[in-house]
């Protein structure tokens, strides 16, 4: 009776869901193996997060648009293991929009989730930031390996998106 | 007082090439972004290219990729667009114009009186 | 791009009066409160001329009979009260994205 009514509850909850992505991948976890995490399809999942690249080339605001419509926002990367899991899937010749910015040119960034912006879990490459018109981060290949750069925000650029996965 | 001074304007044969400069002063020249605009000759406003303050960014809309070059001696306080393959379509007043940054995008606080391209056989 | 459609065309508004030019734009303009949308003016054998910056700040030196407003992708530029100088071709510019573009022209005679 108890597996029928968590059976019942989460085929409800997936209806729910359904109106808003189509496809769920979803993977048994927590102590008893009861509870499923969930991540729209294609999204990719690390820890409590599901990740989606963007290759279409958009602005910044425009990527965060468009993260947002999809339940998202652009990526806040919180600890190196997190950037690490994201540029496994990265192009090395491409840039793509991180959630952080510096709309007033000050040097004062900020996530678009309003998570703290920590400067000792930093990843900018050598010499950056280096100018206050460069208010919207990327991250990108250079020097053997992947960092952060300011650059303008309306030039178009790909993008990653990052939500909380989905409990069922 | 900013003053924005644009000169190389001529007329070019379709296929031609042509050098504009502008000379900045008035303002610390390296550390603004700068643009060139041209204004057609039915009046209408179409950007043509774009150089970042530290000379480490340039964009072109699709209309002029691979024909224009945008370059900067900061030194000389000149801005430059170096035109090539030109075409009749490319006829118009070419204005230098200083990028002013804000929040997510710019607009132009100050434009030169322009020079002007005739592209005709 | 950002198509931005201008109306009217031209216009004739008596000395005095209220002079309204709309820019529409093709999509939004707008981030968080923060709209790009900026206005110049225009007159025969001149550059164009900054009179606001993001929908509604009034460049410095610039006469307070200008205002401007709108959000998202509605923005207008108010004259008022017009005066003879005013006689020019007005233009919106978006900026939130590459490449800028630019409304078509928005020519306001004096009668």
């Known amino acids: 009776n108890f597996m029928y009514s968590k059976t019942v509850k989460r085929l409800s909850k997936l209806q729910e869901y359904q109106q808003y992505y189509p496809s769920l991948t979803c993977v048994m976890e927590g102590k008893d193996m009861e509870d499923w995490s969930c991540c729209p399809t294609p999204w990719t999942s690390f820890q409590s997060s599901c990740y989606f690249i963007s290759t279409v080339m958009q602005s910044w605001t425009k990527s965060q648009n468009n993260c947002s419509v999809m339940g998202a926002d652009l990526v806040v990367i919180n600890t190196k293991e997190e950037q690490d899991f994201i540029t496994q899937n990265l192009k090395i010749n491409s840039a793509y929009f991180l959630g952080l910015s510096d709309p007033k040119g000050w040097r004062h960034w900020q996530w678009v989730d309003q998570t703290p912006y920590n400067k000792n879990v930093t990843f900018w490459h050598s010499g950056e930031p280096n100018s206050p018109d460069e208010r919207c981060a990327i991250i990108n290949f250079r020097s053997e390996e992947w960092g952060w750069n300011d650059v303008h925000c309306h030039v178009p650029q790909k993008s990653i998106c990052k939500m909380k996965k989905i409990y069922i | 007082e900013v003053q924005l001074v644009e000169s190389g304007g001529d007329l070019v044969k379709p296929g031609g090439s042509l050098k504009l400069s502008c000379a900045a002063s008035g303002f610390t020249f390296s550390s603004y972004g700068m643009s060139w605009v041209r204004q057609t000759p039915d009046k209408r406003l179409e950007w043509v290219a774009t150089?970042?303050?530290?000379?480490?960014?340039?964009y072109y809309p699709d209309s002029v990729k691979g024909r224009f070059t945008i370059s900067r001696d900061n030194a000389k306080n000149t801005l430059y667009l170096q035109m090539s393959s030109l075409k009749s379509e490319d006829t118009a007043m070419y204005y230098c114009a200083r990028q002013l940054y804000y929040s997510y995008g710019y607009y132009f606080d100050y434009w030169g009186q322009g020079t002007t391209l005739t592209v005709s056989s | 791009d950002i198509v931005l459609t201008q109306s009217p065309a031209s216009l004739a508004v008596s000395l005095g009066q209220r002079a309204t030019i709309s820019c529409r734009a093709s999509?939004?303009?707008?981030?968080?409160?923060?709209?790009?949308m900026h206005w110049y003016q225009q007159k025969p054998g001149q550059p164009p001329k900054l009179l606001i910056y993001?929908?509604?700040n009034l460049e410095s030196g610039v006469p307070a009979r200008f205002s401007g407003s709108g959000s998202e992708t509605d923005f207008t530029l108010n004259i008022h009260p017009v005066e003879e100088e005013d006689a020019a071709t007005y233009f919106c510019q978006q900026s939130i994205e590459d490449p800028p573009t630019f409304g078509g022209g928005t020519k306001l005679e004096i009668k």
């Open positions: 150089i970042s303050s530290g000379d480490s960014y340039t």
């Open positions: 993001a929908a509604s």
């Open positions: 999509e939004s303009v707008s981030f968080h409160g923060t709209h790009l």
